[in-house]
């Protein structure tokens, strides 16, 4: 059986228009296969009367489009003014016409009834807008002109010129008379609901010389576009809706049962919860389009959504809209990593961030998820050298381990760090995705001290200390700068004393500064690692000041006067420009995530059991 | 919040008609799919017909290929009804008939997602040989 589908009859009236949708799989070669639209012969031939190569045949010529969308496995054939003449039996396929997969479409195109020959057919979207066009003779130009909407057999008055309006059509209808010069009258009917589909009549003039207008209009539901995502990856809705309501509050929601729809986030503010820390509204353009992404996809994050404009910022009968069916492939490319790490006050974490291994070129970024509003994730940090000045000295973007695996390390950290944060690059947008940060009870499991001050010219020694349970690990003390941290070398100074029931396995490494110079000054790092992967991190200031003294100094655990939550960042660090990820593909001036392709996962990107996958900040 | 309402099943002899009725509240039958399901005991639910209308003058319909030249579907719009026509009835038809409705338009695909449906109670439908 061909695995073509489309709708096996199809009824119209003279006059009016079809949209015939035809599905097929998706495979690439199904996608970018010539598409036909063609009419059977009594003798079992089907002579092509369009394609998705550009032919139209003469008797489609100005009426008919036939439109590809690869993306979802679908394409439309849109024939207007049908007549009878259209009635037939045909097929809409792939390939050849003759050896292509098709399916048989039979079209009955009928004179209607109570569809008169004058009738015009008005074919509007949900939520848009329509004006009805009513002409009439000079003899009625001073008389009544009303519209009328047949409801079963009876006509019932919708608006007329005397200032009467059908309860039904209340704020949203409105009668125009044109100028002298022109015998026609309008009627525009605003914020189009399902409902209002139907037939029409206008009128100018009550008896029998009145002149009449037959309308009929359709209020077309948009068809969803269907859209396939990875679970853990992530999705970009573009919302267009029109430049009519570019100044209407804006809103996604996800159809629950049958014409619920749960909003999802809007621009008043609204966010649903389960969308926590992994959803950005992206601020409209002057047009009125925006979009909305969502990162660390879960399998119940499947099903219909719609983008709208309303007052109210959600979903309302007349709203404009677009649809989605999104559909979550549990197969993912995408890889499973931790979406809850946890780390200390005054300690660190090293966040592993996955992205597709065939872009190991492309610029990585981590940015810092925030709720208000409609959502943004200001940047802060690159692979190209930058580091939001708030965080120099206590954050790196490492390309270790490779292969479609980056890492991130912050330390120092604080209360105000806990939070949702993206890992996304500027290739594939799909690949963002979101990990929480929880800031837990606890004490650091490194142990360094807090400020140290060195002499210019002297010798600066610099311990660490590493409890037992990192005896398998190596150890490494560094020196940050944008870039990364520079590894440097260092001394086992043997067993540490700086931990209570802790045996021969922990370890004191130190790190000599010799003959200190200005270009010493800056953080240290000390921490701990197994191969690629990196485990805790701790972080030290080192300041350079004029000799007062002679003699080496050597730092003790006695001397760490900061506290976890200090900064000790000197007024004198350059700041850089404040960055926010804009689409990392668009980045002009500024690093904002835009499109942003920056999402993030913030409730818990489930993993398959639903429960989530987390991440100590002590191990990898 | 969609309701579905079905009638008109009952008990005939094969060869007889019947016209199954279901009614409509939350949702409008016109630019959304409409369909009729059937289930018999110990067998899948399967697709009978599918309906989508834009208008009161244009609609698209697929019927199963068990089907086909004897059950009709159709709909009136005004009342937000849709009807399953069911003529030269055959015992395989006795089953419990489902009226279902998804937002939007017709996948035409019988075995697409019925996660997607909203779903009626159902009535029964018995042909006797």
């Known amino acids: 059986k061909s695995p073509i589908f489309g709708p096996e009859e199809v009824n119209s009236v003279e006059g009016n228009s079809v949209s015939i949708t035809c599905y097929y799989p998706p495979t690439s070669v199904n996608r970018h296969t010539r598409k036909y639209w063609c009419r059977q012969g009594a003798r079992g031939g089907c002579i092509t009367l369009i394609s998705s190569e550009g032919y139209v045949s003469s008797k489609y010529a100005g009426r008919a489009n036939l439109t590809n969308f690869p993306e979802n496995g679908t394409f439309v054939v849109n024939i207007a003014q049908l007549s009878q003449d259209d009635s037939g039996r045909y097929k809409c396929g792939l390939g050849i016409n003759s050896r292509g997969l098709s399916f048989d479409v039979s079209l009955e195109v009928s004179q209607g009834p109570g569809l008169l020959n004058d009738t015009k057919v008005y074919t509007v979207d949900l939520g848009r807008t329509v004006t009805i066009n009513c002409p009439f003779k000079t003899e009625n130009a001073q008389k009544r002109k009303s519209l009328y909407k047949q409801i079963g057999l009876y006509p019932v008055l919708v608006i007329d010129s005397s200032g009467y309006v059908n309860p039904n059509y209340t704020g949203r209808i409105r009668l125009d008379i044109q100028g002298t010069g022109q015998l026609l009258f309008s009627v525009v009917i605003n914020q189009l609901r399902l409902s209002d589909a139907g037939q029409y009549l206008c009128q100018a003039g009550d008896d029998s010389n009145s002149n009449k207008k037959n309308a009929d209009l359709q209020v077309l539901k948009p068809e969803p576009e269907l859209v396939y995502e990875d679970l853990r990856g992530s999705v970009t809705f573009h919302c267009a809706l029109g430049p009519e309501v570019a100044n209407v509050a804006k809103f996604l929601c996800r159809q629950s049962s049958g014409e619920n729809c749960d909003v999802v986030v809007n621009t008043l503010g609204k966010r649903a919860p389960a969308f926590e820390g992994r959803i950005l509204l992206n601020p409209q353009d002057k047009d009125g389009s925006f979009s909305v992404v969502i990162t660390g996809l879960r399998k119940e994050d499947a099903g219909r959504y719609l983008c709208g404009a309303h007052s109210d910022g959600q979903l309302q009968e007349g709203s404009p809209i677009q649809a989605w069916q999104l559909f979550v492939n549990e197969e993912s490319t995408i890889p499973r990593s931790p979406t809850v790490v946890k780390g200390v006050a005054g300690g660190s974490v090293a966040v592993l961030c996955p992205y597709n291994r065939k872009e190991s070129k492309s610029i990585k970024y981590w940015c810092l998820w925030e709720g208000a509003q409609n959502g943004r994730c200001p940047l802060l940090v690159d692979s190209e050298g930058w580091v939001k000045a708030q965080y120099e000295g206590r954050l790196s973007l490492l390309e270790e381990p490779g292969n479609g695996t980056f890492t991130v390390i912050l330390n120092q950290l604080t209360s105000r760090d806990a939070g949702f944060y993206w890992c996304l690059t500027n290739g594939d947008t799909l690949w963002r995705t979101t990990v929480e940060i929880k800031i837990i009870e606890g004490e650091p499991n490194l142990k360094v001290p807090g400020n140290v001050t060195a002499v210019l010219g002297e010798t600066l020694k610099v311990p660490c200390h590493f409890p037992c349970k990192f005896s398998s690990y190596e150890k490494y003390w560094c020196k940050w700068n944008n870039t990364g941290c520079q590894a440097l070398p260092s001394q086992d100074e043997g067993p540490s004393k700086a931990f209570v029931n802790c045996d021969e396995n922990s370890r004191l490494v130190s790190l000599t500064l010799n003959l200190v110079t200005r270009a010493d000054e800056g953080w240290y790092w000390c921490g701990v690692k197994q191969g690629h992967f990196y485990g805790e991190t701790a972080a030290v200031y080192v300041a350079v000041e004029e000799r007062k003294a002679a003699g080496s100094r050597d730092v003790s655990l006695a001397k760490a006067d900061a506290a976890p939550d200090e900064k000790v960042l000197d007024s004198g660090f350059r700041e850089i420009e404040n960055k926010a990820i804009q689409d990392p593909r668009l980045f002009a001036e500024e690093k904002a995530v835009a499109d942003t392709r920056d999402q993030a996962d913030g409730s818990r990107a489930s993993v398959d059991s639903g429960s989530s996958e987390e991440q100590g900040g002590s191990s990898r | 919040e969609v309701q579905l309402v079905e009638s008109g099943g009952g008990s005939v002899q094969a060869g007889g008609s019947l016209r199954l009725s279901c009614a409509a509240s939350?949702?409008?039958?016109?630019?959304?799919?409409m369909g009729w399901f059937r289930q018999a005991p110990g067998k899948e639910r399967e697709g009978v017909a599918l309906?989508?209308?834009?208008?009161?003058?244009?609609?698209?319909?697929s019927h199963a290929d068990s089907v086909k030249g004897r059950f009709t579907i159709s709909r009136d719009n005004a009342k937000n009804t849709v009807y399953l026509q069911m003529n030269s009835l055959k015992p395989e038809d006795s089953a419990m008939y489902y009226c279902?409705?998804?937002?939007?338009?017709?996948?035409?695909?019988?075995?697409?997602?019925?996660?997607?449906?909203?779903w009626g109670k159902g009535t029964l439908v018995t042909i006797s040989s």
């Open positions: 279902a409705a998804k937002s939007g338009v017709c996948r035409w695909n019988w075995e697409y997602g019925m996660d997607y449906w909203d």
């Open positions: 939350g949702i409008t039958i016109s630019n959304n799919c």
């Open positions: 309906l989508y209308s834009t208008s009161s003058t244009s609609s698209q319909k």
